[in-house]
């Protein structure tokens, strides 16, 4: 679609004549008809296929015509098409004089024209205007024209409809062929697709205006680089997303069980050494004097049970005193007033003179210590039980007692419930929803059937007069300590005191 | 605002083991460096400390009670319990679960208390 | 064990009176490890004082710790009814965990 435009610039008519040569009454009241129409060869009357137009009367025999296009005027003529200019046109246009007001073809004689030419040619879109002129043998007349594409049209035909839009169907101005040309921010066929946020990865990222990153699932960040981590995630990173790749010293589904408590934490006090021991636990190893799962209490003084031979420990302000039962003094109770005659060495210790009587000291069977062998050995001090389980002395040994699932010398072994035989002493082994059960047979007792039931012969509180009774573990049998003042097996006898000591 | 709830049978036959439990609430047994404990009192006498669990399932005992005693914690029940065995007459008293804070032993947070009484 | 004695058994003031609370540990507890309690009954006891000396939260500042070494001292400046209570001191920093046998505080 476009408007061919003519510009009608000049008229001469010097004599005022019609084309008959008859003069006009009183001059040449001057208006022109156009024919515009599809390339001819001989341009021959017939239809104009392009168009016709006519003006008013414009002058009087010669005269110029005013360019009244700013004014809403009829110059130039427009005549519009509304298909695809052809690049090639026949053009009439013709003079004629209007003896009265009705300009009507059928109202005027038929000697009235002025003028008539005729043109052909190729014209191609464009706002240059073609400059001609035609002269006969009494007229002369000036114009120009040219093809321009209408409102909304381009190319050299007019052929291409395009309409500049900022709407959802697309964000665009049209070029002078016809093309689109994106408004800033926009890209694609028909500039419907925004320039998202520069950066935004191609991917993970989209946007629905320009300069804008939204995330696909899964990512985030400014440019939607950055993978999103599983739900709940605490110490771990991802490559793609939903991953949850742990940190350092950390492990679990979540990266939330700390394999490196101590580092992270440092829950030992007062010096301690800490050891990882598996996720979030730990093993503070305590200086001496101290004691607690994270060493952070102190022991008294009297914890280390410094008071020899039963004597019993009172914490002081300045540090602790030991009170020493009949028969020893000293510091820590360790000096004795008896010798070998009292049989003073328990648990089938044998006695050995000292100093020409005045002292004496005890070989202790294996199983026992202490300066009377009062003492049954632990051999459990060094904590030898792994996975929890609880050491036992047995004995010239130790044994120890495993945590349900665990097995072997020290428990290292992992195994289920009875097929580990976890009861001692040909106890019977059931399995139960939850663990297990022992039927201990006669003499023994404990939850693995690990106990010895034995005698305690001091229940019967054997001893007179006030005296301390020991149990020998070896013959299941008593001994009795007696105070000052008594002798006999059970302190029954009453006697002289003996002479008193200088200290 | 952290709170503890003690519970548990309040009549206890001698011989048998008690079992208690601490729930906890407003807070968690397994975050931060807090020691939960148990604390007795006997009636109308002073308190007794039995020992605590940590987080990380470390235990310590009032070595006087430490042969009787077993304290552990589950995280995903959000409590902590005590096992007292051996139950006799002389172990009626009221029972508290406690929370101390991190490395030091005052008790700033305290259950309402339990009473367990030993009879057959 | 370290022992913890408090004295006195009972102590009966006026409203307005000041209160003196004493506490003496049977060895030296190091680095302030001493806490103060206050139990009314049918009640769990309730943190007063931490450190020998520290205020817990929400405790008024009429009620004061004092002391170090083996002697502690609780003081309630001005005394008010709500104040009638069961206190005790407790140490923590040997083991195990000991509380005194308890002061009881009357409004006469």
């Known amino acids: 679609s476009g408007v061919f435009q003519l510009q009608l610039q000049e008229f001469i008519n010097e004599r005022g004549v019609l084309a008959s040569g008859r003069p006009c009454e009183p001059g040449c009241r001057t208006f022109f008809r156009v024919c515009l129409k599809h390339f001819q060869a001989v341009v021959s009357p017939g239809p104009c296929t392009f168009g016709t137009v006519s003006t008013p009367v414009l002058g009087t025999n010669s005269f110029a015509v005013r360019d009244d296009s700013s004014g809403g005027g009829r110059n130039p003529l427009q005549l519009p098409f509304n298909f695809t200019w052809p690049g090639t046109f026949s053009l009439i246009i013709e003079a004629w004089h209007a003896p009265g007001d009705d300009l009507r073809p059928e109202a005027l004689p038929p000697d009235a024209l002025i003028s008539k030419i005729a043109i052909q040619g190729s014209l191609a879109v464009g706002q240059n205007w073609l400059l001609d002129e035609q002269t006969s043998t009494l007229t002369r007349l000036r114009y120009s024209y040219r093809v321009i594409c209408s409102d909304n049209y381009y190319g050299d035909n007019c052929s291409r409809l395009c309409k500049k839009r900022n709407d959802h169907f697309g964000h665009y101005v049209c070029q002078p062929d016809g093309n689109l040309s994106c408004l800033p921010g926009w890209t694609g066929e028909y500039c419907q697709q925004p320039i998202c946020l520069s950066g935004c990865h191609e991917q993970n990222g989209y946007c629905s205006k320009p300069a804008e990153c939204l995330c696909r699932p899964g990512w985030q960040g400014r440019l939607c680089n950055e993978c999103i981590p599983h739900n709940g995630c605490r110490h771990g990173t991802c490559s793609t997303p939903w991953q949850c790749t742990c940190d350092e010293g950390w492990g679990g589904l979540f990266c939330d069980q700390d394999l490196n408590y101590c580092t992270h934490h440092s829950p030992c006090k007062n010096g301690a050494t800490c050891s990882n021991s598996g996720q979030r636990s730990y093993t503070c190893t305590c200086r001496p004097g101290y004691t607690g799962v994270d060493c952070e209490l102190e022991l008294s003084e009297c914890d280390s049970n410094p008071c020899r031979n039963g004597g019993s420990c009172k914490d002081q302000e300045d540090g602790y005193h030991c009170l020493c039962p009949p028969g020893y003094y000293g510091l820590h109770c360790e000096h004795s007033t008896l010798s070998c005659a009292d049989s003073p060495c328990f648990n089938g210790g044998s006695c050995r003179e000292r100093n020409q009587g005045a002292n004496y000291a005890c070989e202790c069977p294996p199983n026992f210590t202490g300066s009377n062998c009062e003492k049954k050995v632990d051999r459990c001090t060094s904590n030898p039980c792994a996975n929890g389980g609880q050491c036992l002395n047995r004995g010239p040994s130790r044994m120890c007692r495993c945590r349900p699932g665990f097995t072997g010398t020290y428990c290292e072994l992992h195994v289920s419930d009875c097929a580990r035989n976890p009861c001692a002493h040909g106890g019977t082994c059931h399995d139960l929803e939850n663990g297990l059960m022992c039927t201990c047979p006669a003499g023994f007792s404990g939850r693995r059937c690990e106990v010895r039931t034995s005698i305690d012969a001091c229940a019967s509180s054997p001893c007179f007069n006030r005296a301390t009774c020991y149990t020998d573990l070896s013959t299941d049998t008593f001994v009795c300590n007696c105070p000052y003042g008594f002798v006999g097996s059970r302190c029954e006898f009453p006697v002289g005191l003996p002479p008193s000591f200088p200290w | 605002q952290v709170q503890l709830q003690e519970s548990g049978p309040g009549l206890v036959k001698p011989s048998q083991t008690l079992s208690l439990t601490c729930t906890v609430s407003?807070?968690?047994?397994?975050?931060?460096?807090?020691?939960w404990s148990w604390i007795r009192q006997h009636p109308g006498k002073g308190l007794e400390w039995f020992g605590y669990?940590?987080?990380?399932?470390?235990?310590y005992y009032n070595p006087s009670l430490k042969s009787r005693i077993t304290i552990s914690v589950d995280t995903s029940k959000n409590h902590f319990s005590l096992r007292l065995s051996s139950m006799t007459a002389a172990d009626t008293a009221v029972y508290y679960c406690?929370?101390?804070?991190?490395?030091?032993?005052?008790?700033?947070?305290w259950g309402q208390g339990t009473l367990v009484t030993v009879s057959s | 064990e370290t022992t913890l004695t408090q004295s006195p058994g009972t102590l009966s003031l006026s409203p307005g009176e000041r209160a003196t609370l004493s506490c003496r540990a049977s060895?030296?507890?190091?680095?302030?490890?001493l806490a103060w309690y206050q139990q009314k009954p049918g009640q769990a006891p309730r943190l007063l004082i931490y450190?020998?000396?520290s205020r817990a939260t929400g405790i008024p500042d009429r009620l004061s710790g004092s002391g170090s070494g083996t002697d502690f001292t609780l003081t309630i400046s001005r005394l008010e009814p709500e104040d009638c209570a069961v206190y005790y001191c407790?140490?923590?920093?040997?083991?195990?965990?000991?509380f005194g046998q308890g002061t009881k505080v009357e409004i006469k």
């Open positions: 406690a929370r101390a804070g991190s490395g030091s032993h005052y008790f700033d947070y």
């Open positions: 407003g807070g968690s047994v397994s975050s931060g460096n807090y020691y």
């Open positions: 669990i940590k987080n990380s399932g470390g235990t």
């Open positions: 060895q030296s507890v190091s680095s302030s490890y």
């Open positions: 450190g020998a000396s």
């Open positions: 407790q140490q923590y920093g040997y083991s195990p965990i000991t």
